[in-house]
Interface confidence: medium
């Protein structure tokens, strides 16, 4: 399977909410011994590999923001901790998963990464991620609502396998 990032850039005004999205592509095994671990974190554009460094989002680590479920099951974070920080991650039946950030500030600008680990118990883990940039703007040049920029077809299938 692969992870696609439908949008590579989100430009939002301060105070707005934004939902960053990734999508699982390709065959998803629905076997009872296969589960998916999905999460989000901030990173930097490394010289070798994007998304290698895992930084917190609003002081919450990728461990705090995880979703864990079987194939094609819906899930969302019910963590009070995440919601207190204006964050919520969610996953639907169609392979889409997202993180919603409320009341954006300039400090939220940066590179965001989604991570999916397919866990085949007794056997292996397969890891893929996607990256997107969030720019929060203020002042007269800021858009009135979030503007999203589609990924090129090459960028939208941002694949890294363990």
């Amino acid at each position: 399977f692969k992870v696609a990032t439908p949008y590579s850039l989100y430009v939002c005004p301060e105070g707005q909410n934004v939902t960053l999205t990734c999508r699982l592509l390709g065959p998803v095994d629905k076997g009872h011994d296969v589960t998916f671990y999905k999460t989000w974190y901030r990173s930097s554009r490394g010289e070798v590999q994007t998304c290698s460094e895992r930084r917190p989002i609003r002081n919450l680590t990728f461990q705090d923001l995880h979703l864990h479920h079987g194939g094609h099951q819906a899930a969302n974070t019910s963590h009070d901790l995440a919601q207190r920080h204006g964050l919520e991650s969610a996953s639907d039946h169609h392979g889409n998963f997202s993180i919603t950030m409320r009341n954006l500030t300039l400090l939220d600008s940066g590179l965001y990464c989604c991570l999916v680990v397919e866990i085949r118990h007794h056997h292996s883990e397969h890891r893929v991620h996607g990256a997107m940039e969030l720019q929060v703007q203020t002042g007269k040049d800021a858009p009135s609502n979030c503007v999203v920029y589609p990924s090129s077809s090459q960028d939208s299938e941002n694949i890294t396998a363990a």
């Epitope: 589960t35 290698s52 990728f62 461990q63 995880h66 866990i119 363990a162």
Partner: antibody, heavy 118, light 106 residues
């Protein structure tokens, strides 16, 4: 604060079995795998296996199949490792450690010393 | 299973000296992880995903490598760095550790 508190040292007789506990606190127990590692007197670290509190799934190092049995009690956020038919070669320090998928073992218990002797 | 061979087995360094130790894998691995262990203590995560510092790890530590060859470097040795260092892989079951490099202070 993340903590993994293991049960105390054990002196057991050859042929006996025993169970080590690892009580987790300060994090979401079901969001991690609980891993067990053996460190013998020669100081080598060996991965025994893991259990997912999320669904009870286990994966074992083939070397420890039949020697170690991993279980969890979600209600008390406690992981257990039972060691069977102990011999002197099982004398070691055993650690539990949490691991997020796609990451590393970032928190470890303090270790449980097991001595097998008659 | 993937065998991780660490070298040297034992080394010593003076304070302020640069230290490099290596970990060679019998088959290619995607990422390497490094742990530090001091006598009487549990292992501590130092480096994840080959080159990233775990929380609270001093900036003098760094990791690099790919495929079958990885290394851990301490830019300037300090007395508190005296310990045994283990590499570890999560790429293939069973997950394995190297045999360790014991670093002593001169």
């Amino acid at each position: 604060e993340v903590q993994l508190q293991q049960s105390g040292p054990e002196l057991v007789k050859p042929g006996a079995s025993m169970k080590i506990s690892c009580k987790a606190s300060g994090f979401s127990f079901t969001g991690y795998t609980m891993n067990w590692v053996k460190q013998s007197h020669v100081k080598n670290l060996e991965w025994i296996g893991l259990i997912s509190p999320y669904n009870g799934g286990t994966s074992y190092n083939q070397k420890f199949k039949g020697k170690a049995t991993l279980t969890v009690d979600k209600s008390s956020s406690t992981a257990y490792m039972e060691l069977l038919s102990l011999t002197s070669e099982d004398s070691a320090v055993y650690y539990c450690a949490r691991r997020a998928y796609g990451y590393a073992m970032d928190y470890w218990g303090q270790g449980t010393s097991v001595t097998v002797s008659s | 299973q993937i065998v991780l061979t660490q070298s040297p087995a034992i080394m010593s360094a003076s304070p302020g000296e640069k230290v490099t130790m290596t970990c060679s894998a019998s088959s290619s691995v995607s990422y390497m992880y490094w742990y530090q262990q001091k006598p009487g203590s549990s292992p501590r995560l130092l480096i994840y995903d080959t080159s990233n510092l775990a929380s609270g790890v001093p900036l003098r530590f760094s990791g690099s490598g790919s495929g079958t060859s990885y290394s851990l470097t301490i830019s300037r040795m300090e007395a508190e760095d005296a310990a045994t260092y283990y590499c570890q892989q999560w790429s293939s079951y069973p997950f394995t550790f190297g045999s360790g490099t014991k670093l002593e202070i001169k």
